[in-house]
């Protein structure tokens, strides 16, 4: 039975040209996290494997940085980066947990960032 829950940064906004941290946190389960996939719509951005480390998809290498933690940093944002992002936690023995974040990239300099989720 899957008892875990994923907390995310939720809906966030950022300025064009800036950067943002996408953060998820899996709680309420003792399942072992074997891998976290970060996806944008149907595109794989990055993988963090518990044993081997990070893999950043080649097409995002210049604009995506690992971390902090299991999170992902998006840099040099463009309006095309607006959309849904998913953190997919592969765990054993529970299975897969998915969290959703919506990022809006704004042209103006008055982008109000949603409350950042901090992993303790």
């Amino acid at each position: 039975m899957m008892t875990g829950t994923i907390e995310t940064t939720g809906n966030i906004s950022a300025e064009k040209g800036g950067s943002i941290i996408l953060q998820c946190h899996l709680s309420s389960t003792t399942a072992q996290v074997t891998q976290v996939n970060w996806e944008q719509q149907d595109q794989l951005l990055a993988i963090c494997n518990a044993d081997l480390g990070w893999h950043i998809s080649p097409s995002f290498k210049d604009r995506v940085a690992p971390g902090p933690g299991l999170g992902l940093t998006l840099q040099s944002l463009t309006v095309n980066d607006t959309g849904e992002y998913f953190c997919i936690y592969h765990t054993y023995p529970d299975g897969t947990y998915t969290g959703r974040i919506f990022l809006e990239v704004l042209e103006s300099s008055v982008a109000e960032h949603g409350a950042r989720f901090q992993i303790p």
């Epitope: 072992q32 081997l52 950043i56 023995p93």
Partner: antibody, heavy 117, light 107 residues
């Protein structure tokens, strides 16, 4: 006591195939990722590939991608490395190693693969 | 791929000496750095993981330090059984990569 025991090495001609096995004991095999690491004679260590404990997803070094396949049978506590289209540069001692927190914490004794005509 | 460079490639030391081996990564790897010892004809053994954590059963004369790109393995008082080749390995970016090794020989 954690133990890993490789087998299946030997002499094979270029272009040939070989399957290595790694029998695990002393720990819950299905809880751990496992990697293959090789060492050419007189050279350093090179990671070959990895398989996840439960879902079975795999990663490979570019040098073996498309030629080598890692699989596992958790019911038999055994890891496999299927090596096809072997080349002279694949000659090495092949080790299986348990992955833990980024390191390879336990290793087998190794099995020698020689690719030569 | 991340390149790992060890120095020196070999060194000669005496029993009781303090020995330091360094490992440099071509880009930051935070603290995802492991150290191994290998003796001729034997499999490598994990000594240190996550830059400074001692693996089970490893004597306390071995210690590791560093973060980012620069790391150090120190043997505080070299023992006869410590003559071997030492490898560093990063586990921050796939694929995992090893240094070329440092051979510690008897002076």
């Amino acid at each position: 006591e954690v133990q890993l025991l490789e087998s299946g090495g030997g002499l094979v001609q270029p272009g040939g195939s070989l399957r290595l096995s790694c029998a695990a004991s002393g720990f819950t095999f299905s809880n751990y990722g496992v990697s293959w690491v090789r060492q050419a004679p007189g050279k350093g260590l090179e990671w070959v590939g990895y398989i996840n404990p439960s879902r079975g997803y795999t990663y490979y070094a570019d040098s073996v991608k498309g030629r080598f396949t890692i699989s596992r049978d958790n019911s038999k506590n055994t890891l496999y490395l299927q090596m096809n289209s072997l080349r002279a540069e694949d000659t090495a001692v092949y080790y299986c190693a348990r992955s833990y927190g980024g390191g390879f914490d336990y290793w087998g004794q190794g099995t020698l693969v020689t690719v030569s005509s | 791929d991340i390149q790992m460079t060890q120095s020196p490639s070999s060194l000669s030391a005496s029993v009781g000496d303090r020995v330091t081996i360094t490992c440099r990564a071509s880009q930051t790897i935070e603290r995802r750095l492991n150290w191994y010892q290998q003796k001729p004809g034997k499999a490598p053994k994990l000594l240190i993981y996550d830059a400074s954590s001692l693996h089970t059963g490893v004597p306390s004369r071995f210690s590791g330090s560093g973060s980012g790109t620069d790391f150090t393995l120190t043997i505080s008082s070299l023992q006869p059984e410590d003559f071997a080749t030492y490898y560093c390995q990063q586990s921050y970016i796939i694929p995992p990569t090893f240094g070329q090794g440092t051979k510690v020989e008897i002076k």
